[in-house]
């Protein structure tokens, strides 16, 4: 069963600092044996990965979406699955890898002016409407007056980073912008290859915190340009 996979791949002897206790996320490094991990149409072995149960796409990482690992998807446990690359089949945008979106059941590049226009247009519309959605978590939930009172906290709607509390920045999440945590050391960051490319991001990340810069991760230097992982590192 899926659960035997979940349990047999539990991380052994996890030291406390990695654990994200006291409300802080831990290290981005996972130390589990290689397991079968669905990606595209084939199962591939990914080292150092543990299945991650989820209820929503937004709980998963940027390169993942939330779904049942079995075809047909029963009502059992869902896990974060590897995002679908270009030209792979999809049912919703979140299934496609960053830089792509789901069109007519296929992941296609979002590096097209008309799609970028659609995103910008929708964001503009959402801020001119009292019933705009809060973020990816509440696309199906309208804003209540209570949410406006928590303005500036994580998850609050914003227009610019100055609308957010200390330690947060204003970043895109689906079709609106919300306050998200400024990135800490070791967290994955986005390095924009060309000016203006951030306009294509549906899940925008904050910038790196003070004293940190977004640089290529040392052990990823050998990777191809497109798959290089950038993390927030000390200057």
């Amino acid at each position: 069963t899926l659960n035997s996979v979940l349990n047999s791949n539990a991380i052994k002897n996890l030291p406390p600092p990695l654990g994200g206790a006291a409300g802080h996320p831990g290290s981005a490094v996972s130390a589990a044996p290689g397991i079968l991990y669905p990606g595209g149409n084939k199962y591939q072995t990914i080292d150092n990965y543990q299945p991650y149960p989820c209820a929503e796409d937004e709980e998963c990482g940027t390169d993942e979406y939330c779904a049942s690992p079995t075809r047909g998807g029963d009502a059992g446990v869902q896990i974060c699955l590897a995002c679908r690359k270009r030209r792979k089949r999809c049912m919703r945008h979140a299934m496609c890898c960053p830089g792509n979106y789901c069109k007519n059941g296929i992941c296609v590049s979002s590096d097209q002016n008309h799609f970028r226009g659609e995103i910008e247009e929708t964001i503009t519309e959402s801020f001119g409407n009292d019933h705009s959605t809060l973020d990816g978590y509440s696309r199906r939930t309208t804003l209540s007056s209570k949410m406006y009172h928590t303005k500036g906290q994580e998850g609050s709607v914003c227009l610019r980073s100055s609308d957010c509390a200390s330690g947060l920045c204003c970043a895109r999440h689906f079709w609106s912008k919300i306050c998200k945590p400024v990135l800490k050391e070791g967290q994955v960051c986005t390095k924009h290859r060309r000016k203006g490319s951030h306009g294509l991001e549906i899940f925008q990340r904050c910038y790196c915190g003070e004293g940190l810069s977004c640089r290529i991760q040392k052990d990823h230097h050998q990777a191809s340009n497109s798959s290089r992982l950038h993390t927030c590192q000390r200057h």
Epitope: S30, Q50, E64, G155
Partner: nanobody
Framework: EVQLVESGGGLVQPGGSLRLSCAAS????????LKWVRQAPGKGLEWVSH????????MYADSVKGRFTISRDNAKNMLYLQMNSLKPEDTAVYFC?????????????????RGQGTQVTVSS
């Protein structure tokens, strides 16, 4: 700052019950799915149960299915875990947790926001 504070743990005999609570603050509670994870002595983190934003969907690990019930009260910013028919193998530190979400490329249990945990010991 995200804060999660668990309570309700303790020593209980096999077959007994406990109800864990988790008080959350520092984030808009009702828009996040939440979960319980546990860590037995000398073992890694193990996912226990999950609940959707509105509480309408729940998921459980096979090892606790039919014995544990997860619930939430969005008005009070509280998450709960009702544990019945407890077994010695349920002995662990229990954490309530929230995903770190889209700030990582791949999600993992150790990336989650979670509290300090509450100890549950099942022994006769």
């Amino acid at each position: 700052e995200v804060q999660l504070v668990e309570s309700g743990g303790g020593l209980v005999q096999p077959g007994g019950s406990l109800r864990l609570s988790c008080a959350a603050s520092g984030f808009p509670f009702s828009i996040y799915p939440l979960k319980w994870v546990r860590q037995a002595p000398g073992k890694g983190l193990e996912w226990v149960s999950h609940i959707s934003r509105d509480g309408g969907r729940t998921m459980y690990a096979d090892s606790v299915k039919g014995r544990f019930t997860i619930s939430r009260d969005n008005a009070k910013n509280m998450l709960y875990l009702q544990m019945n028919s407890l077994k010695p193998e349920d002995t662990a530190v229990y954490f309530c947790a929230r995903s770190a979400g889209k700030v990582v490329s791949r999600a993992s249990l150790e990336n989650d926001y979670r509290g300090q945990g509450t100890q549950v010991t099942v022994s006769s």
